[in-house]
């Protein structure tokens, strides 16, 4: 198959009724048949990608290069788009035959590898309508969905899932943690026509739920009754002072008293030093502030809870998930440290197909990738040890030379020569 596959399925009515299973559910028609692959990009045809992907026309933007990186599972299969310049914005996009996800599942999937040990940079994709001017894609360009990992500083290591709903970008209310190691990871977003979603990393579910519950698309179903307020006689005190309790008569004693054992120094001169006052000490009989005993409040009514009413502003929307038009996939990113590789892009309507595709791409090469990285790390460790040994050897040699220089000069004769010399002399 070619490196880029685009297939738009818009079946006619006859095809639908003959070939597809029909299911009616919540005003939505579900088509369950052959998977529609709207977009697939694996970068398997060398420089062919340059004719399919469009860069923003701006000289100071970063360049993407085709690379499998410093380590990989398969040098050819693992080639993807790699950010190559530090501290740059990146803007690159590919178009496909426009489609709508109305009445069907949408699956967006791709792999990301931050082999540079990323400090701050995006690893997400944006899905745009086909009205996007690809040559002028930028951070404020309106998109339908933004999905993928984002790392920036110690505080941000998350998977963004953002939907544009009625013209506004709405962020997920949950915190989905992304992978922050140096290996390739598979990110999958599934959006279903029953307004549910699922996020998977490495083909394992990390989050799921309902669009309405996990995003603030709609006003809340319930609101606090604006006409209700806490009655003035509502008593929220669980305990009160015991009215029958009274302070003992001998309670009030000063906190500090003059030290009874202190004596005026003999050399104290009242004219010079003023009137002598004994130093004060803590009064052992001081009891502190008296507080009446606490008893249960007979009028206690508990904490007043503001009653809620149905929000008149709320009305359900069964088509939150749906978009009329998807036509462009874009990488619109900032990276402080470059080196991220994007690969294995897939947009489809079939969850099983996406999982299979993930297993056949990321799944096949992940173990070999780790092996190669481990081998490199081991070689690096060995090289480091060798360098350390060499350094130590050099240091020892230098020390020996220094010692020789410092010690007094002796004739440089071998033991054998010295012994023979002594024998002949004798």
């Amino acid at each position: 198959s070619s490196s880029l596959e685009v297939l738009f399925q818009g079946p006619g009515l006859n095809d639908i009724f003959e070939a597809q299973k029909i299911e009616w559910h919540e005003e939505n028609l579900y088509f369950q048949g052959e998977p529609a692959v709207y977009f697939k990009e694996q970068f398997l045809d060398g420089d062919g990608w340059t004719s399919r992907w469009i860069e923003k026309h701006k000289s100071d933007f970063g360049k993407f290069v085709l690379s499998s990186g410093k380590f990989y599972g398969d040098e050819e299969k693992d080639k993807g788009l790699q950010t190559s310049q530090d501290a740059r914005f990146y803007a690159l996009s590919a178009s496909f035959e426009p489609f709508s996800n109305k009445g069907q599942t949408l699956v967006v999937q791709f792999t990301v590898k931050h082999e540079q040990n990323i400090d701050c940079g995006g690893g997400y994709v944006k899905l745009f309508p086909n009205s996007l001017d690809q040559t002028d894609m930028h951070g404020d360009s309106e998109y339908n969905i933004m999905f993928g990992p984002d790392i920036c500083g110690p505080g941000t290591k998350k998977v963004h899932v953002i939907f544009n709903y009625k013209g506004k970008n709405v962020l997920i209310n949950k915190d989905i943690r992304c992978k922050d190691d140096e290996f390739t990871h598979l990110y999958t977003l599934i959006v279903r026509p029953d307004n549910t979603y699922e996020v998977k990393i490495d083909n394992s579910q990390v989050e799921s739920g309902s669009l309405e519950d996990d995003w603030d698309f709609l006003p809340p179903k319930k609101i606090k009754d604006p006409d209700a307020s806490k009655p003035e006689d509502w008593d929220e005190r669980a305990k009160i002072d015991d009215p029958t309790d009274s302070k003992p008569e001998d309670w009030d004693k000063p906190e500090h008293i003059p030290d009874p054992d202190a004596k005026k120094p003999e050399d104290w001169d009242e004219e010079m030093d003023g009137e002598w006052e004994p130093p004060v000490i803590q009064n052992p009989e001081y009891k502190g502030e008296w507080k009446p005993r606490q008893i249960d409040n007979p009028d206690y009514k508990g904490t007043w809870i503001h009653p809620e009413i149905d929000n008149p502003e709320y009305s359900p929307d069964p088509s939150i998930y749906a978009y009329d038009n998807f036509g462009v996939l874009g990488l619109d990113l900032w990276q402080v440290k470059s080196g991220t590789i994007f690969d294995n892009f897939l947009i489809t309507n079939d969850e099983a197909y996406a999982e299979e595709f993930g297993n056949e791409t990321w799944g096949v090469t992940k173990a070999a990738e780790k092996q190669m990285k481990d081998k490199q790390d081991e070689e690096q460790r060995t090289r480091r040890m060798m360098r350390t040994k060499m350094r130590m050897r050099r240091m020892r040699r230098t020390r020996r030379k220094m010692r020789r220089k410092m010690s007094p000069a002796r004739p440089r004769t071998s033991c054998r020569e010295a012994c023979l010399q002594g024998w002949t002399e004798a």
Partner: antibody, heavy 127, light 107 residues
């Protein structure tokens, strides 16, 4: 939570430059975006620009482009705003304000508002 | 460039509800933040992303945003709420502030 402390008041001559500093403490400097906002006497708030220290790049309001330079020194957790070619209309209180870093795109930092502000620095431009 | 329009002043009796509006073309598509500024002090964020309250801001402050108008609502107004209020959005890589509204609590 981060705290922002600004440099003291300045009196400048028209045509000269002023450099105001904003030192952050109590948080990781690289986890914030810093904006500069000014307020002329009796007027509203006006955004001049911002910087994300970890990015090292600044973003300026059209009106101040070419006249303002915003920088950050991560080693001292300090952001700077330099305004050149001063005129009397630049007499104002200059504030630095921070937004938490929520991602690697410019828009994130303004998505949550500016939640911590410096005490303000009064700059008077007079001949 | 994007323009945010606020009324110059709003008055409210103590204990009543004050509503401050912020108009802008399709502002409902943007995230709106609100700041409170008392005389001689730096601004304070009271609402972010249309309707979210930062910690320490009383529940009496709430926000909404749809169509061409965003609204800051202060219920059970108190004398201490008297201040200037500014709305703010992010548009075309720029922060835009409204002109500000002076809230007067009568009495």
């Amino acid at each position: 939570e981060v705290q922002l402390v600004q440099s003291g008041a300045e009196v400048k001559k028209p045509g000269s430059s002023v450099k105001v500093s904003c030192k952050a403490s109590g948080g990781t400097f690289s986890s914030y975006a810093i904006s500069w906002v000014r307020q002329a006497p009796g007027q509203g708030l006006e955004w001049m620009g911002g910087i994300i220290p970890i990015f090292g790049t600044a973003n300026y309001a059209q009106k101040f482009q070419g006249r303002v330079t915003i920088t950050a020194d991560e080693s001292t957790s300090t952001a700077y705003m330099e305004l050149s070619s001063l005129r009397s209309e630049d007499t104002a209180v200059y504030y630095c304000a921070s937004s938490p870093l929520r991602g690697s795109g410019w828009y994130w930092h303004y998505y949550y508002g500016m939640d911590v502000w410096g005490q303000g620095t009064t700059v008077t431009v007079s001949s | 460039s994007y323009v945010l329009t606020q009324p110059l002043s709003v008055s409210v009796a103590p204990g009543q509800t004050a509503r401050i509006t912020c108009g802008g073309n399709n502002i409902g598509r943007k995230s709106v933040h609100w700041y409170q500024q008392k005389p001689g002090q730096a601004p304070v964020l009271v609402i972010y992303r249309d309707s979210n309250r930062p910690s320490g801001i009383p529940e009496r402050f709430s926000g909404s945003n749809s169509g061409n108008t965003a609204t800051l609502t202060i219920s059970r107004a108190q004398a201490g709420d008297e201040a200037d209020y500014y709305c703010q959005v992010w548009d075309s890589s720029t922060v835009v502030f409204g002109g500000g509204t002076k809230l007067t609590v009568l009495g």
